[in-house]
Structures are given as C-alpha cells and as structure tokens.
C-alpha cells in the first residue's frame, strides 16, 4: 500500500540545488508523478508503454528529472526563498489496474539566504 | 589572502550526509586542513610531498574526504542533532614558506529531526 507519511529521504542537496525524490512501488509499470509546492504543480512526468513495450516519457513542464524503477527524482536548481514551502508528490497509477491516485511523501523545505535547509513536519 | 568570512558554498548536502568544503589557495603545495565543530577536531588531512615529489596523504581520523588543488572536502554521514553547531576549517601551510596557520570559512549547520539544514551566520 502506498501511504502519505513523510519520507525523510525525500530531499537531498547538491551544490545549490535540491533533488526531490518521489517513490513509487516497483510493481507500477505506467504512471504519472506530479510534484506540488503547496497547491502548485511544479513538475509532471508521465511514463507509459507503447507497442513493443517501448517506454514513452512525457515531461510537459520540462523539469530536470531522473526516473528509476521505483522513484522519480526532480531537480530544482537554485531554489529561492519563495520555495520555502510544503512539497509533496502525487502519483497516478495506470498499470497495473485498478487506476489509483495517491498523495505520497511530503515535507517542508525552507531556504535561509540561499542556503538549503530541510525540515520535515 | 585567506580570510575567515563565511563562505556560502561551505556546505552541500547528499542523501543524509553533509559535505563541508574547506578552500585553500592553489599555490599551497603542502598543508594540513582540520575541520572543527566548535572546539572539537572532527577531521584532519595532511598533504605533503616526499622524495621524487610523491604526494603523501595522512588522514588519521579516517574521515571520508575529497582533495583537489584548492579545497579539501570532508563528508560527515548521518550527522545527528548534536551536530547543530558552528563548523570551521583551520589551515596550516607548510609549503610554500612561511609556515602559517589560519582559521578559514565558518558556518552554522543545524539539524532538525535528522534532516540536514544549513544556515550560515
């Protein structure tokens, strides 16, 4: 089962940027992962399969990302103080059925004077 | 000249650990770099040259480190809340002469509930 409890590994930091990892079960084959800041969608990534099992990736908001078989990581470069907010991931599962939508891990990311700090609530 | 002002690039974060970078001038050939938390030495790295200009590295506290021609980076894994303290680097220059000892960049690193946060004072 996918739950919405805070995952302390959601955030990691890399020289002025933040990587936000959104986990999903390895059994999921086709999905949409969205990263929210408060109510705003910052990033969206859709993974589907086409004929011959070819994977199709749709990244309409042109976010930097890394996709593995159990997570989508979005990279936010040089986040500013306006990004000291609550972040969470939202997962839509297309395959295997049934179709599901779940809000996943969430955490509070606070920026001090261009420094990266992370406090999970 | 080496000064002790806070360097906002001193800290960077990597999946539950913190990288603390201690800069030094590229002209320095032989040196000892120590990382302090308050008055406690956490890490120490000495780079010297021997016969045939072979580089010797001494790392008595077995810290994870990365050495470049202008910085020593120490990696602290899973820092706990007791490490919400003032960190600074201390540089001893052996070569070129004269022998010098300098306290370098310092910054305040605060940990919230095992998450890594960084606020430079």
């Amino acid at each position: 089962e996918i739950n919405g409890s805070a995952d302390h590994r959601m955030f990691s930091f890399h020289n002025g940027g933040v990587q936000i990892s959104c986990k999903y079960p390895e059994t999921v084959q086709q999905l949409k992962m969205r990263l929210f800041r408060e109510r705003e969608v910052l990033c969206e990534l859709t993974k589907t399969k086409g004929s011959g099992n070819a994977v199709s990736i749709k990244n309409p908001m042109l976010c930097l990302y890394h996709l593995s078989n159990n997570s989508v990581s979005f990279f936010l470069n040089n986040p500013d103080s306006s990004q000291g907010s609550y972040y969470f991931c939202s997962l839509s599962i297309f395959d295997p059925p049934p179709f599901q939508e779940r809000n996943l891990s969430g955490g509070y990311l606070h920026i001090y004077e261009s420094q990266l700090c992370c406090q999970l609530k | 000249e080496i000064n002790g002002s806070a360097d906002h690039r001193m800290f960077s974060f990597h999946n539950g650990g913190v990288q603390i970078s201690c800069k030094y001038p590229e002209t320095v050939q032989q040196l000892k770099m120590r990382l302090f938390r308050e008055r406690e030495v956490l890490c120490e790295l000495t780079k010297t040259k021997g016969s045939g200009n072979a580089v010797s590295i001494k790392n008595p506290m077995l810290c994870l480190y990365h050495l470049s021609n202008n910085s020593v980076s120490f990696f602290l894994n899973n820092p706990d809340s007791s490490q919400g303290s003032y960190y600074f680097c201390s540089l001893s220059i052996f070569d070129p002469p004269p022998f010098q000892e300098r306290n370098l960049s310092g910054g305040y690193l605060h940990i919230y509930e095992s998450q890594l946060c960084c606020q430079l004072k």
Epitope: - | K32, T46, T48, G50, S51, S56, P60, D95, P97
Partner: antibody, heavy 124, light 108 residues
C-alpha cells in the same frame, strides 16, 4: 616539553653494525617527519636520512645509501637508524631531528627540535 | 647535490655590532627552501630562520634572513653576548639535503 633522546651509540670496528634509537616525548610523534643528521668531530653538519610520518617514504644521503636503514615505530614514539658496514668516516655525533611544521614529512622541511646527540666511533 | 658555500669562515666582531653572513648555493634553491641554524659548543643546532626569511618560534627580531635563488644572507642587527656561535645554512629543497660548512662568529 618536547624531548628527543638518542641512544645506541658506542665504539665499533670497521665493517661492524650499530642500531641507534631516538625516543620522543612531549609530542604527538606521528605528526612529524624525522631525520638523522650527523656531525663529525670538529666538522659541520651532514644530513644522513629522513623518514615520513608512517615510514612510507624514506631517503638517504649518497654516503650511507645501501648501508643505513631508517625506520620508526610510532607506537613506541621511536625512530631508528640501523647502520651496517660501518666505516671510519661514519664516526660522528648523530642527532635525530624533528620536522618543524608537524607536517609528517622530512621533505622540504627544516628541523626545529634536535636531540642531544649520540656518539658513534668507528675504529680498529 | 647542491653545495652550499659560506663566507666568511670566521667573523670577529664586538657586542652591539652588526653581523652579515653569506651563503651561496651551487644551483638555485627553489621556493626559498633555505634555513639558518645556530650552534653553540656542546649543544645541538637551533633553528633561527626558515624559508630564507621567516623567523622560527622564539627567535629575537635582531635575526633576519634574506635572499633567493643562489644567494642568501643572515643578518644580526646588534650582536648580543649569547650570539657568538657557529651559524650554518641548510638547503632542504633537493635531496640530499645539505648544510654549509659554517661561519664562526667570535668576539673581537
């Protein structure tokens, strides 16, 4: 207070062997590179050999290369000089000397602390 | 090896006078890896100057070093009675590390 105390000197015949020791106190011994420097009676100073903090780097003057071996035991705060195939010209007061910087190297460093010296006499 | 030549061999001066000692290297001593030591009879050498011009810990400021490349000098601005001794230059640039033959500063 830093102290370096040499021992093991004496009179030996040409071709013989001696092992000099230098024990350090009042210092974190493995922070320092060490050297042996000798002084023949009434003469000047001659660097003999050097060793870095962990013994991984050693060097010798041409006059003793292949005959003398420098080593150290950090657990015992001790520096050694094994002298084989001794010659009359090896007769001297032998000093152990510590690297000034605490760099762990004997290379590109001057010497600040010296022992009081130990006399080695090679004579038939 | 780098051969160091010191001059003069002996310097006879009175307390209060200035002493200037010379050390010449057979080839350039890079990065100023040159030191000066003082040795009194029956004692171990004492580091005075390193890096050609930097005073070692506890050395009075009447001692100063200068020079680069192949020519170096040690100056004692006003000789004190305890300064009468033998002075050696030492290059630690290139192995084998070498010392000069020494300059004896004695009382006139």
């Amino acid at each position: 207070e830093v102290q370096l105390v040499e021992s093991g000197g004496g009179v030996v015949r040409p071709g013989g062997s001696l092992r000099l020791s230098c024990v350090a106190s009042g210092v974190t011994f493995d922070d320092y590179g060490m050297s042996w420097v000798r002084q023949a009676p009434g003469k000047g100073l001659e660097w003999v050999s050097g060793i870095n903090w962990n013994g991984g780097d050693t060097d010798y003057s041409d006059s003793v290369k292949g005959r003398f071996t420098i080593s150290r035991d950090n657990a015992k705060n001790s520096l050694y000089l094994q002298m084989n195939s001794l010659r009359a010209e090896d007769t001297a007061l032998y000093y152990c000397a510590r690297d000034f910087y605490g760099s762990g190297s004997y290379y590109h460093v001057p010497f600040d602390y010296w022992g009081q010296g130990i006399l080695v006499t090679v004579s038939s | 090896e780098i051969v160091l030549t010191q001059s003069p061999g002996t310097l006879s001066l009175s307390p209060g006078e200035r002493a200037t000692l010379s050390c010449r290297a057979s080839q350039s001593v890079s990065r100023s890896y040159l030191a000066w030591y003082q040795q009194k009879r029956g004692q171990a050498p004492r580091l005075l100057i390193y890096g050609a011009s930097s005073r070692a810990t506890g050395i009075p400021d009447r001692f100063s070093g200068d020079g680069s490349g192949t020519d170096f000098t040690l100056s004692i601005s006003r000789l004190e009675p305890e300064d009468f001794a033998v002075y050696y230059c030492h290059q630690y640039d290139m192995s084998p590390f070498t010392f000069g033959p020494g300059t004896k500063v004695d009382i006139k």
